[in-house]
């Protein structure tokens, strides 16, 4: 689609005569008829196949035609066409005399013709005007012409339609040849594809406008090159989306099991030493003068029963004081004024004279101690049971009752529920306070990974561009069924754009 433009510049008819030689009365009131048609080697009458146009009266006898795009007179004359410009044409320009105001062909006498010129040739589309001058014996016409494309049409023959746009359907202007020229930040055949932020990860990132980088599910960061850990993860990181790789000191499926309770919680009080002993488990070694699971209890000086021979202990600010029974003296009532004759040995202890009868010593039966065998042996005073075990006096010996998950004479060994490898099919075993837990490899499930399940290889949405994902049950892998226009194992490449 385009326009043939004809610019009339000057018409000379000095004698003011018609083609017949007869003069016009009072002068030749001149108007023009233009006929544009397909190329003919010899221009003949017939339909104006490319269009025709008439002018109003432009002057009398000889005159210059001024440029005018307003009013009745339009110069240059416009002959629009809505087909591909063929590059060749025939042009007929007739100058007529108008005796009256009616310029219709049927209203004019045949001899009102002043002159007629016909040209033919090649004409390329372009902005430049071709200047021509045609002379007959009595008249001369100077004019120029050109062919230009209509708005939104481009190319050598005005056949390429291109309308600039900046909307959802494209972001471009049109080049002179009709090709699209994308606006900055846009690419693709119709400039619909934004150019993402430089460095934006090709697979993990995308954009809906230029210089943007939006992440696909499971990825984060400026360039979408960092994964997001699993929703339930507490103290872990990832190397691929939805993983939960535990930070140091944490364990369990979601890294919520505290393996370093001592550091994270500092449970031991009063300067005690803390030792980790498994998940959420610890042992406090108390400083002298403190007791309790967390060494939170301050020992009374009298708690160690320092007074011997039945002496009673009284706490004092600066220590303690022993009140001795009759026959004993000393800081701890350790000295006796008694002899074996006073039967000082209790609980079946036997008395032995010393220092020629000035003192004595008691030999105690099992389970009793003290200068006078007055104290029952408590074999639990040294807190021998580790890991929260309970100490029990059993006659001449003691026994530790261990908490679940521990064993040994002193509960010093952690019982691993995982020792017997209970997880089938390569499952990973985790010791928990409540028992063991198996983390199963892909394709297995159940408390002990004993059930074979089909892997949903499509669970991670591996297919791009709205492809349909299928799980190949024989190989437990995914297969992407690409929509029209996309290829690749994940349908990630548009047809015609091979992987770079």
């Amino acid at each position: 689609s385009g326009v043939f433009q004809l610019q009339l510049q000057e018409f000379v008819n000095e004698r003011g005569v018609l083609a017949s030689g007869r003069p016009c009365e009072p002068g030749c009131r001149t108007f023009f008829r233009v006929c544009l048609k397909h190329f003919q080697a010899v221009v003949s009458p017939g339909p104006c196949t490319f269009g025709s146009v008439s002018t109003p009266v432009l002057g009398t006898n000889s005159f210059a035609v001024r440029d005018d795009s307003s009013g009745g007179g339009r110069n240059p004359l416009q002959l629009p066409f809505n087909f591909t410009w063929p590059g060749t044409f025939s042009l007929i320009i007739e100058a007529w005399h108008a005796p009256g105001d009616d310029l219709r062909p049927e209203a004019l006498p045949p001899d009102a013709l002043i002159s007629k010129i016909a040209i033919q040739g090649s004409l390329a589309v372009g902005q430049n005007w071709l200047l021509d001058e045609q002379t007959s014996t009595l008249t001369r016409l100077r004019y120029s012409y050109r062919v230009i494309c209509s708005d939104n049409y481009y190319g050598d023959n005005c056949s390429r339609l291109c309308k600039k746009r900046n909307d959802h359907f494209g972001h471009y202007v049109c080049q002179p040849d009709g090709n699209l020229s994308c606006l900055p930040g846009w690419t693709g055949e119709y400039c619909q594809q934004p150019i993402c932020l430089s460095g934006c990860h090709e697979q993990n990132g995308y954009c809906s406008k230029p210089a943007e980088c939006l992440c696909r599910p499971g990825w984060q960061g400026r360039l979408c090159n960092e994964c997001i850990p699993h929703n339930g993860c507490r103290h872990g990181t990832c190397s691929t989306p939805w993983q939960c790789t535990c930070d140091e000191g944490w364990g369990g499926l979601f890294c919520d099991q505290d393996l370093n309770y001592c550091t994270h919680h500092s449970p031991c009080k009063n300067g005690a030493t803390c030792s980790n002993s498994g998940q959420r488990s610890y042992t406090c070694t108390c400083r002298p003068g403190y007791t309790g699971v967390d060494c939170e209890l301050e020992l009374s000086e009298c708690d160690s029963n320092p007074c011997r021979n039945g002496g009673s202990c009284k706490d004092q600010e600066d220590g303690y004081h022993c009140l001795c029974p009759p026959g004993y003296y000393g800081l701890h009532c350790e000295h006796s004024t008694l002899s074996c004759a006073d039967s000082p040995c209790f609980n079946g202890g036997s008395c032995r004279e010393r220092n020629q009868g000035a003192s004595y010593a008691c030999e105690c039966p099992p389970n009793f101690t003290g200068s006078n065998c007055e104290k029952k042996v408590d074999r639990c005073t040294s807190n021998p049971c580790a890991n929260g075990g309970q100490c029990l006096n059993r006659g001449p010996s003691r026994m530790c009752r261990c908490r679940p998950g521990f064993t040994g004479t002193y509960c010093e060994r952690h019982v691993s529920d995982c020792a017997r490898n209970p997880c089938a099919h390569g499952g990973t075993c985790h010791d928990l306070e409540s028992g063991l837990m198996c983390t199963c490899p892909a394709g297995f499930s159940g408390r002990r990974c004993e059930v074979r399940t089909s892997i949903d290889a499509c669970a991670s949405s591996p297919c791009f561009n709205r492809a349909t994902c299928y799980t190949d049950l024989s190989t437990d892998t995914f297969v992407c069924n690409c929509p029209y226009g996309f290829v690749g194992s994940r349908c990630e490449f548009p047809v015609g754009l091979p992987p770079s």
């Epitope: 400026r222 929703n231 993860c233 990181t237």
Partner: antibody, heavy 118, light 107 residues
Framework: EVQLVESGGGLVQPGGSLRLSCAAS????????MSWVRQAPGKGLEWVAS????????TIGDSVKGRFTISRDNAKNSLYLQMNSLRAEDTAVYYC???????????WGQGTLVTVSS | DIQMTQSPSSLSASVGDRVTITCRAS??????LAWYQQKPGKAPKLLIY???NLADGVPSRFSGSGSGTDFTLTISSLQPEDFATYYC?????????FGQGTKLEIK
């Protein structure tokens, strides 16, 4: 136990500013992306902004872009939302949440009410 | 932006009933859909993610299904504590968008 506690809400005049804070505990804060989600009185939920974990890359919703900024301080286990040029339509309960714009919002705070009114 | 449409907007049911809530996306979101439960004056709580995965500590009476554009939340046997408002949310396309909510009331 994961805990998110928002603070800083209150009554503010149109055109005013407010800064919301969120204190996180019970998880390694620096490992996870965080978001703000809001809920106008009697209405549904609307995502406001997200921030990535290590490079603190902020993504802001169109309705608040140019007015709100999201930031974090991993050393203080804290998330922030700076709200400027507040409008009546910003009136809502603002929730701090662990999650990103392309993931589920796994944990939520109790919310803090922001009222924009003259 | 992707529109998420929940139906019904509200429903009444009794303890022990089986209840189904649906959520429709205006375009394909694959399986990137979550469900939340919200009680009056409280924050939302994640129930289900990736269409059918139960979040930590959520009772097994809750289940999710669907793919593409149509999704369902099912409560197999309603308990008194399940009466609340439920929201679906897509996180496949930016920005993330929520459904308008479904209020589950006691009949």
């Amino acid at each position: 136990e994961v805990q998110l506690v928002e603070s800083g809400g209150g009554l503010v005049q149109p055109g005013g500013s407010l800064r919301l804070s969120c204190a996180a505990s019970g998880f390694t804060f620096g490992n996870f992306p965080m978001s703000w989600v809001r809920q106008a009185p009697g209405k549904g939920l609307e995502w406001v902004a997200s921030i990535s974990s290590s490079d603190s890359w902020a993504t802001i919703g169109d309705s608040v872009k140019g007015r709100f900024t999201i930031s974090r301080d991993n050393a203080k286990n804290s998330l922030y939302l700076q709200m400027n040029s507040l409008r009546a339509e910003d009136t809502a309960v603002y929730y701090c949440s662990r999650g990103y714009y392309n993931s589920p919002f796994a944990y939520w705070g109790q919310g803090t009410l922001v009222t924009v009114s003259s | 932006d992707i529109q998420m449409t929940q139906s019904p907007s509200s429903l009444s049911a009794s303890v022990g009933d089986r209840v189904t809530i649906t959520c429709r996306a205006s375009e394909d979101i694959y399986s990137n859909l979550a469900w939340y439960q919200q009680k009056p004056g409280k924050a939302p709580k994640l129930l289900i993610y990736d269409t059918n995965n139960l979040a930590d500590g959520v009772p097994s009476r809750f289940s999710g299904s669907g793919s593409g554009t149509d999704f369902t939340l099912t409560i197999s046997s309603l308990q008194p504590e399940d009466f609340a408002t439920y929201y679906c949310q897509q996180y496949n396309n930016y920005p993330p968008t929520f459904g308008q909510g479904t209020k589950l009331e006691i009949k």
